[in-house]
Amino acid sequence: YSTSHPCFVSRPCLNGGTCHMLSRDTYECTCQVGFTGKECQWTDACLSHPCANGSTCTTVANQFSCKCLTGFTGQKCETDVNECDIPGHCQHGGTCLNLPGSYQCQCPQGFTGQYCDSLYVPCAPSPCVNGGTCRQTGDFTFECNCLPGFEGSTCERNIDDCPNHRCQNGGVCVDGVNTYNCRCPPQWTGQFCTEDVDECLLQPNACQNGGTCANRNGGYGCVCVNGWSGDDCSE
């Protein structure tokens, strides 16, 4: 039925679109970039990304339409909705603070939650992170007892241990939790780069032509025989 199919008879896909036969008399067009519609008859108005703030663009009859995310309005979703214009968002005397696409309640002492509708209990849940222990110090105050290696009012900061590092023999400090590690140059190993790598064990053929390998701190040397010389007895 190919010669009588609409793809060949009426050539329905416009603007360079490609026609695909789906059945005896149905088809689908794959449009060139910049065109849209069942028959690629419309210019794709979404090509210029007119919709702002994460909204979804659709093209209808050469026009674009933006579906806005909550908190934005306008033809291109470019306008932030000021939720604080509508009273009652924040309970118990909380102050409404407008944010792009949303709002936040700044709660008075004793209240918490998105709408200031929950009673604030300093350590329930605990604001202390990284294993810190919360201790209530007043009706509305707390302090965090941090595990070694952490600091900050909620133990949120890993203390940098590298300023006091003791990496030896050219090792480079890498911070850890209440410790540090040393990235060693090839000739050294161990946590602090204090252990000499035995190159003679690692490279059995380090010395050529019957030369004997002698390990040294931070390197190795070759003892050459039979007139050979050079770093590896190859000369």
């Epitope: 003791r166 030896q168 023999n169 410790t179 204090t194």
Partner: antibody, heavy 120, light 107 residues
Framework: EVQLVESGGGLVQPGGSLKLSCAVS????????MEWVRQASGKGLEWVAA??????????VYSASVKDRFTISRDDSKSTLYLQMNSLKTEDTAVYYC???????????WGQGTLVTVSS | DIQMTQSPSSVSASVGDRVTITCQTS??????LAWYQQKPGKSPKLLIY???RLQDGVPSRFSGSGSGTDYTLTISSLQPEDFATYYC?????????FGGGTKVEIK
């Protein structure tokens, strides 16, 4: 043979300044951490300051008791370590030792020490 | 700063005795511990590094052990030249800190 020889100690009044030197030989100076350690008469050892090696950009660390008053430095061309001591206090009175950090997390070579007396 | 607690502060012993000195640190120092010997009017001398490694030229009667926060220096058979003060020192991180010292005296 590794050798460290301190000099520059003496009697100075509180608030005064003094510069200690430590001339080293027998090893490649820039390859090692260098430390100053002091010892008050009849007391234990107290670490004062350190300067890391070339591989660690000669970075410097001080004890809290001397920070902002003492300055450690080195002159590689002269293989000499220095300790500039300003705003001296009576509690800084001690024998000052220069030592080499031998790449083992330990101080494997020490000078003979130089006595600093801070008194009015 | 890492605190070093060395004990005892002094010990009376005789030639041939076995002497044990301990050093406790306020946090794990990953075996970054050294032991020094100091005689009156002299500079300290390194005996042990890395908690258990004998420095070149140091007699084998000296030995070190330990890990984490607990370390020990042992003199297996005390000799006349061993009467001195001994210090432990952590080399894990700055500021370097020393123990208070242990004076080994003749009984």
């Amino acid at each position: 043979e590794v050798q460290l020889v301190e000099s520059g100690g003496g009697l100075v009044q509180p608030g005064g300044s003094l510069k200690l030197s430590c001339a080293v030989s027998g090893f490649t100076f820039s390859d090692f951490y260098m430390e100053w350690v002091r010892q008050a008469s009849g007391k234990g050892l107290e670490w004062v300051a350190a300067q890391r090696n070339k591989a660690n950009d000669f970075s410097i660390v001080y004890s809290a008791s001397v920070k902002d008053r003492f300055t450690i430095s080195r002159d590689d061309s002269k293989s000499t370590l220095y300790l500039q001591m300003n705003s001296l206090k009576t509690e800084d009175t001690a024998v000052y030792y220069c030592s080499r950090d031998g790449g083992k997390l330990a101080l494997d070579a020490w000078g003979q020490g130089t006595l600093v007396t801070v008194s009015s | 700063d890492i605190q070093m607690t060395q004990s005892p502060s002094s010990v009376s012993a005789s030639v041939g005795d076995r002497v044990t000195i301990t050093c406790q640190t306020s946090e794990d120092i990953y075996s970054g511990l050294a032991w020094y010997q100091q005689k009156p009017g002299k500079s300290p001398k390194l005996l042990i590094y890395g908690a258990s490694r004998l420095q070149d030229g140091v007699p084998s009667r000296f030995s070190g052990s330990g890990s984490g926060t607990d370390y020990t220096l042992t003199i297996s058979s005390l000799q006349p030249e061993d009467f001195a003060t001994y210090y432990c020192q952590q080399g894990f991180k700055y500021p370097l800190t020393f123990g208070g010292g242990t004076k080994v005296e003749i009984k």
